[in-house]
């Protein structure tokens, strides 16, 4: 006895496609075993018609393909466009076609639906609209107009020109008498029922000499597309509903148990608590079509999803929908990276974030999750030198360490950075991934001056306090700007004096600005790294002044408590372009980044003279890219 | 909810035939798939056959015990599952339950069918 199984019997009609499962242990061996799909000949071989080795026969080319998922234990054969010369025995199994390890399957594809008796077939997605045209002739023009619908041997009236529906159809259906010219009343029935489905009776007149027509309308079930996602990576159902119910609340919801189909997100406002911080409901077009994004994949999220459109935005008897089964495998090309980084208030984070390593060349964005309405990404930094205004002189995006991974290095935290942040590229639109900042109690470990002023033409010494847990780490003084941060010369002086408890192993590093200029001003960090992991920072702000008095400055902690300087912004001061990922499309078709301009940004993108706690030191008080 | 009603159960002698009808009724369209599963005396209650559908194609599922014996087919209009058992034996006779599924990744196991009917009795003497 085999240990494969399958479905013993396939019925279908022309032009339809099939989706068939097979089952099969899920051994080592057999996970990785070859898969085939084969049809068995009247002298008893089995001829392959694909594999998971890619072959594919030049029958099937262009419309099958076979899918493996071997978490499941399963693998699926899909074919499309199915015509009556499909029709026959079949074998699905593993490894070699003669060796036994199969099941028989028997594939029946009849006629199409067509014009049988004078019954015209109507076939309609649930949920959609139907139109019923009825023709008469002129003797019967001012008579009564009806359609019945077959329940058994009877006929039973389901609505007429006189006024009657039946309260099935109640608030869906209407029936609409064409123009003098046209001898044709037509019954539209909206918001298609699976139990709709049936023969119908339409007629002219209620006597010997009434016209009459048969219309067989059949009700489809969406097929569910099967989706094979990576964990930890992304997916997005694209849901395309018609034009018909534009206006209409559209949902994503995951089937679980019973009949019940819980909203994931829906444009009324509702979001599933599993799903915060890492989906994205992309606004709708002018048809009615919208798409769902949804990050950092997990092991549960699998599963039948459904999108739909109804009023109370949730899945209703007569919502036109979409059906997907989500498959989510968990032997990923996405590497494991946390999915929670925990920072100090004051102090930074170094988050890595995965891209596909075979697109080394596109462009990195980082974005921070917004929660309101549907959800959107709006971009803080990328790889090409934009950073949005806000973060100037604490964000950096580094291409470093390379091969498949970024780092954003966030600093000056304060409790408003706590959130979700989205990694992401211009390429592969599966590997957006989601990491959560949460903003702990505790001291910066690095200790700086909170504010420095040099003067022009004199030195400035600013020191760096490292406690000696970062004895085997590399230190280093960079100067941001916004393609990164430049390394800059910086001297060891020793153990430093600033931490209780702390040995020889501390350390105290300087950088020093000989003769200082205009273009030295601007923020400095200094920090940790080992090799390419970076590891804490900490910023200063350096202004520059004119000469007040000769000799040089050797800034020091004493000062790390002053106030941050106050000043406001001058009037020219550049807006720069917000940059937000609302449509998950322009990471896929169009790689392009959309500009909106800065205007209504929320609180992040106001421009205001407000304390440090607000938003971290005194970043926003000094523009120097005029 | 989803109601299920099975008949058709009976008593019957080895080797002739019998029909189960069950008829669903509520919230049908959110369902994929509905089977026939048997609980024979002192015995755990075990597969036998599954219908599953998209549009107007079926997939049929059978127990190696019954194939050729059974078969399984719908009613859509009526929301009525049929499992038609010819060449009856001794060894069929079992509770037969009816069940159904809005989500089915392997139609063998019963924890992916969410909703049952009562059960209709099938005695098959020698």
């Known amino acids: 006895k085999s240990p494969i199984f399958g479905p013993e019997e396939v019925n279908s009609v022309e032009g339809n496609s099939v989706s068939i499962t097979c089952y099969y242990p899920p051994t080592s061996v057999n996970r990785h075993t070859r898969k085939y799909w084969c049809r068995q000949g009247a002298r008893g071989g089995c001829i392959t018609l694909i594999s998971s080795e890619g072959y594919v026969s030049s029958k099937y080319a262009g419309r099958a393909n076979l899918t493996n998922f071997p978490e499941n234990g399963t693998f699926v054969v899909n074919i499309a466009q199915l015509s009556q010369d499909d029709s026959g025995r079949y074998k699905c199994g593993l490894g070699i076609n003669s060796r036994g390890l199969s099941f028989d399957v028997s594939l029946e594809v009849s006629q199409g639906p067509g014009l049988l008796n004078d019954t015209k077939v109507y076939t309609v997605d649930l949920g959609r609209t139907v139109t019923i045209n009825c023709p008469f002739k002129t003797e019967n023009a001012q008579k009564r107009k009806s359609l019945y619908k077959q329940i058994g041997l009877y006929p039973v009236l389901v609505i007429d020109s006189s006024g009657y529906v039946n309260p099935n159809y109640t608030g869906r259906i209407r029936l609409d008498i064409q123009g003098t010219g046209q001898l044709l009343f037509s019954v539209v029935i909206n918001q298609l029922r699976l139990s709709d489905a049936g023969q119908y009776l339409c007629q002219a007149g209620d006597d010997s000499n009434s016209n009459k027509k048969n219309a067989d309308l059949q009700v489809l079930k969406p097929e569910p597309e099967l989706v094979y996602e990576d964990l930890r990576g992304s997916v997005t159902f694209h849901c395309a509903l018609g034009p018909e119910v534009a206006n209409v609340a559209k949902f994503l919801c995951r089937q679980s148990s019973g009949e019940n189909c819980d909203v994931v997100v829906n444009t009324l406002g509702k979001r599933a608590p599993a799903f915060e911080g890492r989906i994205l409901l992309n606004p709708q077009d002018k048809d009615g079509s919208f798409s769902v994004v949804i990050t950092g994949l997990r092991k549960e999220d699998a599963g039948r999803y459904l999108c739909g459109a109804h009023s109370d935005g949730q899945l209703q008897e007569g919502s036109p929908i979409q059906a997907w089964q989500l498959f989510v495998n968990e032997e990923s090309t996405i590497p494991r990276s946390p999915t929670v980084v925990k920072g100090v208030a004051g102090s930074s984070v170094a988050v890595l974030c995965p891209y596909n390593r075979k697109e080394s060349k596109s462009i990195k964005y980082w974005c921070l999750w917004e929660g309101a309405q549907n959800g959107r990404c709006p971009l803080l930094v990328d790889s090409e030198g934009w950073v949005k205004a806000q973060y100037e002189g604490r964000l950096s995006l580094l291409e470093e360490p390379g091969n498949g991974t970024f780092t954003v290095i966030l600093n000056q935290l304060t409790s408003r950075d706590a959130g979700f942040y989205w990694c992401l590229t211009n390429g592969d639109t599966l590997w957006r991934t989601t990491v959560e900042i949460k903003i702990i109690e505790g001291e910066p470990n690095l200790k700086v001056p909170g504010n420095v002023t040099a003067v022009l033409g004199e030195t400035l010494k600013v020191p760096c306090h490292f406690p000696c847990k970062f004895s085997s780490y590399e230190k280093y003084w960079c100067k941001w700007n916004n393609t990164g941060c430049q390394a800059l010369p910086s001297q060891d002086e020793g153990p430093s004096k600033a931490f209780v408890n702390c040995d020889e192993n501390s350390r105290l590093v300087s950088l020093t600005l000989n003769l200082v200029t205009r273009a030295d001003e601007g923020w400095y960090w200094c920090g940790v790294k080992q090799g390419h992991f970076y590891g804490e920072t900490a910023a200063v702000y350096v202004a520059v002044e004119e000469r007040k008095a000769a000799g040089s400055r050797d800034v020091s902690l004493a000062k790390a408590d002053a106030a941050p300087d106050e000043k406001v912004l001058d009037s020219g001061f550049r807006e720069i372009e917000n940059k937000a990922i609302q449509d998950p499309r322009l990471f896929a078709e169009e790689k392009a980044v959309a500009d909106t301009r800065d205007q209504a940004d929320g609180s992040r993108a106001s421009v205001d003279s407000g304390s440090s706690e607000e938003q971290g030191g005194s970043s926003r008080h000094h523009h120097h890219h005029h | 909810q989803v109601q299920l009603v099975e008949s058709g159960g009976g008593l019957v002698q080895a080797g002739d035939s019998l029909r189960l009808s069950c008829a669903a009724s509520?919230?049908?369209?959110?369902?994929?798939?509905m089977g026939w599963f048997r609980q024979g005396p002192g015995k755990e209650r075990e597969f036998v056959a599954t219908?599953?559908?998209?549009?107007?194609?079926?997939?049929?599922y059978y127990t190696d015990s019954v194939k050729g014996r059974f078969t399984i087919s719908r009613d859509n209009a009526k929301n009525t599952v049929y499992l038609q058992m010819n060449s009856l034996k001794p060894e069929d006779t079992a509770v037969y339950y009816c069940?159904?599924?809005?989500?089915?990744?392997?139609?063998?196991?019963?924890?992916?069918?969410?909703?049952w009917g009562q059960g209709t009795q099938v005695t098959v003497s020698s």
């Open positions: 219908i599953t559908w998209s549009g107007s194609t079926n997939y049929k």
């Open positions: 509520g919230r049908t369209f959110t369902t994929y798939g």
């Open positions: 069940a159904a599924s809005t989500v089915l990744t392997d139609p063998r196991r019963l924890n992916e069918y969410d909703y």
